[in-house]
Interface confidence: medium
């Protein structure tokens, strides 16, 4: 229905709380450089405004869309040019022409410090003193690193935040209590981060119908009771949701998020058996919940998937009357009986079975063309599984540091072009797959090892694309968002690479590495892990396990010498003479 | 807005046949399964025969098997019973609904949207 003020309507339905941290989520993902205290008066002008307009629908303005509104705000903002180079040229440019431009504008690596934890007294004395100020300050630097983050999403994480401070800053031990909790919500905020941007991609790269279909498997998989056409309505709701957070309509994406959530607790029945506990939590926590659901048990007496797509006489006229609908109904009757493969592996299977169509029903005999085409899915499964099977082995024997090590080699060879700060990132995230995946039941490994490792790789394309280096990897960024993980699997060591000169500074440490913290002095070893095999991209792994391990007793005797600055001066060129004359 | 029209009904002798249609308007037909249930004089609802969305999955109330036949045709959002052998006790009201859901073990049918129905009548 139509509202006549946009804003009153998104404020009332909100409330006054959401409406102010989604506000702030949206600037500080617009704008990212700009100061807390900026955006925080922005917000505070907006909302005050949104007020006006649930008093008087007709007062001046309120008729006004909220990329307008909003738009205007941040373009009266002063020195936007200095600030912002040419995302200042945005403004000069009409609704929705200026909100595209805004978006284009989205830096996915802004240079940004670390987000840096106060220590843990630090921390209270200022959750305690103003919650409001402190949980904005949250949603702020988390917003400004990661300018796709699902807005909704993000509040929830800062429901948590704002849950963990309220239980252990009444602690004796505030530390003991906080790090591992926190630990744990940042985790899983920065692992939602990348898979809400892979669902951006997938939405800004190849479009709505993309999405759905991803939408469509994964509820299938979960909810196997329902029928295919709630499953469409309910991927009809979730694309819907997810194109208006991907484009900055964060407000009316958490306003929808809402009412699907209040819409599947309504129809629990006809939707799984698994939602009631979800459905009794606030808002927030019940979308969360809903989002993190368990499948719900697979109905007994499933037929045959082939008696429907390949046995049945009708499959080509079914096809041509309507292919969507009939891709669709294939893809939710196979995606609800295998929640043990990945979405990504499913959309491949269905990609595989539209095109066996699409040719044999061109052909005179299609049923004996299209006879086969489940045989043909072996293939398709076997390489993921194997996938898992041998970096699951891989992880158990050398554990997360040592799998992430493996993973920077591999990938170093397959794209020494690319930023060593970018594949070391990729690397740790790649390699952190094992302790997310591996420890899992067997029919849950390959859909978490698979769709993580998509969404790890889309990020290594979206930061790509800012300054693409490596044709191999813009051949596999380019492709369909599916054969991703596969292509990158499939490529090998890179035989055009001139390796890079060996450069004595690249290898040279200094005391201040004793004081690293253990996170900050492994991305050190592994930042000159990959500068070694940048030299020599044809290392043996024995030839690096020396260097490293060398490597590593070098850091451990001079962090424990009494002259620390001295060791590392001159046993550090010694270090480089061994590594150059071991890689030789 | 959803509309199921339903015709075809009226008087047969015993082991007769009739053929029902019901014509469907105001939303995807072929997304949805489809069901013929009917309601004799003084009894409740009885489900007769449920189709999948092309129609490669029929299933029959056991009163039913063996004389009855459901279709549907998509590109004319028609769904069809076809009714053979017919007795006096498949006398009833016949409605085509819409699935909502539909457990096939019985424990979980919903039907969303229903036509006004039509008459069938087996007498001598």
């Known amino acids: 229905e139509a509202h006549k003020s946009e804003i009153a309507h998104r404020f009332k339905d909100l409330g006054e709380q959401h409406f102010k941290g989604l506000v702030l989520i949206a600037f500080s993902q617009y704008l990212q450089k700009c100061p807390y205290e900026e955006h925080i008066k922005l917000v505070q002008e907006v909302t005050d405004f949104a007020k006006t307009c649930v008093a008087d629908e007709n007062a001046e303005n309120c008729d006004k869309s909220i990329h307008t509104l909003f738009g205007d705000k941040l373009c009266a903002i002063p020195k936007l040019r200095d600030n912002y180079g040419e995302l200042a040229d945005c403004c000069a440019k009409q609704e929705p022409e200026r909100n595209e431009c805004f978006l284009q504008h989205k830096d996915d690596n802004p240079n940004l410090p670390p987000f840096q934890r106060p220590e843990a007294e630090a921390m209270c004395t200022s959750f305690q003193e103003n919650p409001t100020s402190f949980l904005g300050h949250y949603l702020h630097e988390v917003a400004r690193r990661h300018p796709y983050f699902y807005a909704p999403e993000l509040l929830y994480y800062a429901e948590k935040y704002n849950e963990v401070l309220t239980q252990c800053c009444t602690e004796s031990d505030k530390a003991a209590c906080l790090t591992p909790k926190l630990d744990a919500v940042k985790e899983k905020a920065l692992v939602a981060a990348v898979r809400q941007r892979m669902k951006c991609s997938s939405m800004q790269r190849f479009g709505e119908r993309a999405f759905k279909a991803w939408a469509v498997a994964r509820m299938s998989q979960r909810f196997p009771n329902a029928e295919f056409a709630e499953i469409t309505k309910l991927a009809t709701d979730v694309t819907k949701i997810n194109k208006e957070c991907c484009h900055g309509d964060l407000l009316e994406c958490a306003d929808d998020r809402a009412e699907l959530a209040k819409y599947m607790c309504e129809n629990q029945a006809t939707i799984s058996s698994k939602l009631q506990a979800c459905c009794d939590k606030p808002v927030l926590q019940k979308s969360q919940c809903l989002a993190e659901i368990e499948h719900d048990n697979i109905p007994a007496d499933l037929p045959s998937i082939a008696a429907d797509f390949v046995e049945d006489k009708e499959v080509c006229k079914n096809y041509a009357e309507a292919k969507d609908v009939f891709l669709g109904t294939f893809l939710y009757e196979y995606s609800r009986r295998h929640p043990d493969y990945s979405v990504s592996l499913l959309l491949r299977l269905a990609k595989k079975y539209e095109a066996t169509l699409e040719k044999c029903c061109a052909e005179g005999d299609p049923p004996a063309c299209y006879g086969t085409v489940l045989a043909e899915f072996q293939p398709l499964v076997e390489e993921p599984k194997n996938l898992v099977k041998t970096n699951c082995e891989l992880y158990e024997k050398l554990g997360e540091y040592g799998f992430q090590n493996a993973v920077l080699v591999r990938y170093t060879q397959k794209a020494p072009q690319v930023s060593t700060p970018t594949l070391v990132e990729a690397a740790r995230n790649l390699g952190r797959v094992g302790t997310k995946c591996c420890t899992l039941p067997e029919a849950q490994r390959l859909p978490c090892v698979e769709d993580y490792l998509s969404a790890i790789l889309n990020r290594l394309c979206v930061l790509h694309e800012k300054t693409p280096v490596s044709e191999k990897v813009t051949k596999c960024c380019s492709g369909s968002l599916v054969e991703r993980r596969p292509c990158f699997s499939a490529l090998t060591v890179d035989e055009t690479y001139v390796p890079k000169e060996f450069k004595a500074e690249t290898f040279t440490f200094h005391s201040d590495i004793c004081t690293l913290p253990d996170k900050e002095k492994q991305i050190k070893k592994q930042t000159a892990l990959a500068e070694l095999v940048k030299h020599k991209p044809k290392a043996t792994e024995d030839q690096l396990k020396t260097v490293m391990g060398d490597f590593a007793q070098f850091v451990d005797k001079c962090c424990k010498a009494a002259d620390k600055d001295n060791c590392f001066a001159t046993e550090g060129p010694n270090l480089v003479a061994r590594s150059k004359e071991a890689l030789a | 807005e959803v509309q199921l029209l339903e015709s075809g009904g009226g008087l047969v002798q015993p082991g007769g046949s009739l053929r029902l249609s019901c014509a469907a308007s105001?939303?995807?037909?072929?997304?949805?399964?489809m069901v013929w249930v009917r309601q004799a004089p003084g009894k409740g609802l009885e489900w007769v025969s449920m189709i999948s969305q092309f129609g490669n999955q029929t299933y029959y109330a056991d009163s039913v098997k063996g004389r009855f036949t459901i279709s549907r045709d998509n590109s004319k959002n028609t769904l069809y019973l076809q009714m053979n052998s017919l007795r006096a006790e498949d006398t009833a009201v016949y409605y085509c609904?819409?699935?909502?859901?539909?457990?096939?073990?019985?424990?979980?049918?919903?039907?969303?949207?229903w036509g006004q129905g039509t008459l069938v009548t087996v007498s001598s």
């Open positions: 609904a819409k699935v909502r859901s539909w457990d096939q073990t019985g424990g979980r049918r919903t039907f969303d949207y």
């Open positions: 105001g939303f995807t037909f072929s997304l949805y399964r």
